[in-house]
Amino acid sequence: EKSDLRTVAPASSLNVRFDSRTMNLSWDCQENTTFSKCFLTDKKNRVVEPRLSNNECSCTFREICLHEGVTFEVHVNTSQRGFQQKLLYPNSGREGTAAQNFSCFIYNADLMNCTWARGPTAPRDVQYFLYIRNSKRRREIRCPYYIQDSGTHVGCHLDNLSGLTSRNYFLVNGTSREIGIQFFDSLLDTKKIERFNPPSNVTVRCNTTHCLVRWKQPRTYQKLSYLDFQYQLDVHRKNTQPGTENLLINVSGDLENRYNFPSSEPRAKHSVKIRAADVRILNWSSWSEAIEFGSDDG
């Protein structure tokens, strides 16, 4: 139940409270406020201080993780006196019960899998639940399809990523009838967790002196244009001695993705395969199917 934040607090306390769903820290407003400030300190003594207008009695923390425990602090000055109040936000529950080894990846442009492991001290009846909030915090996505291990949720599959933004907050809560279960939370960038498909429509056409490789950029979850891709071509002569170096060629993305290389007839049997990456991160996709060209008697 939300109270009216504009009410005047008793002189002794600011009545600081935190809503983890909205990441909003609020306190009772003081008459004739001249200065107010809110911040949090994490276990590593890092301080996060959001911007705050003087007349506000709340502040919102945008990009924070809470599972290690944080301390919120509010300082308010009025024309009469100053107020300070701390609010501890611990990760209550038994140590070691939270989900661990949490990771997510986006694949096939519109699917996402998240996986985690049961906490080492979690009881047998533990159950985990995943919630995702986008950076705009407008909506919360509950996991629609859980991956289970002996009845315990250890992963989640999403086939609708429309609610995600470029940066998202992931929260894994836990429940048990026996003990309190700690939560785990994480902030992930979609650009860093997307695994590209290999390039498609790979073709090779040769004339007497050259071969031209063409391909199409992979479809991706992120809205990218051709220069946002980097490619690697593996041109490989068949039936060579083991340990012979493959020719790896780096090619920048272009409007028409192509690579032309000298290869004169008679041409030995070769294969070519291509992989793609985000030019910023170089997280390579798997290789495309190998395309063969040339002849055995070349």
Epitope: K223, L224, S225, Y226, L227, D228, L255, D278, V279, R280
Partner: antibody
Amino acid sequence: QVQLVQSGAEVKKPGASVKVSCKISGHSLSELSIHWVRQTPTKGFEWMGGFDPEENEIVYAQRFQGRVTMTEDTSIDTAYLTLSSLRSDDTAVYYCSILGSVTAWAFDYWGKGTMVTVSS
Amino acid sequence: QAVLTQPSSVSGAPGQRVTISCTGSGSNIGAPYDVSWYQQLPGTAPKLLIYHNNKRPSGVPDRFSASKSGTSASLAITGLQADDEADYYCQSYDSEDRMTEFGGGTKVTVL
């Protein structure tokens, strides 16, 4: 090879409107993000707006909001820029270009430019 | 007044190395947003030379290189040639203006 062919030079009176076209050949307009940038001797290059793939819509620079309209006719692979309520300081070369990188907002492939002169 | 500041001109003899600076602020280059560089030969449209701070589109010679540090970026041209004589512009997104901005341009003269 992709080419952006722009319409010819225009001379307009203050208060009038101008419509500049940009015909894409060698590639389908529906697969591209077209942006408009103008260049003046005094202000240099000014980005005016264009199709933002992340927003999935045409976005405009604040300073031209209300005066500029960008449209596309994908059936003839042509993009259009209309600037209304023209003033003398709108005298510039207007370029269409392709957004080659969404993440860097880099413009690759440019038209040759359309000179628009606003004079009474 | 351009949001990104460049020197108005630099010059060098053929074969020399010249660098062009581009100074921004915490709302653009330092935010950090990526920097692109363009070359504009006299009477022609700009040509993209560098994007993502240091990547070259295919067809741009490796004599052109770029880097970025803090709130500024720089473009280097090694082995300067007569046909490098042109205007060079940097570009970056600016979160305060909420749009992409260009530098005022630097004229490179080959002596």
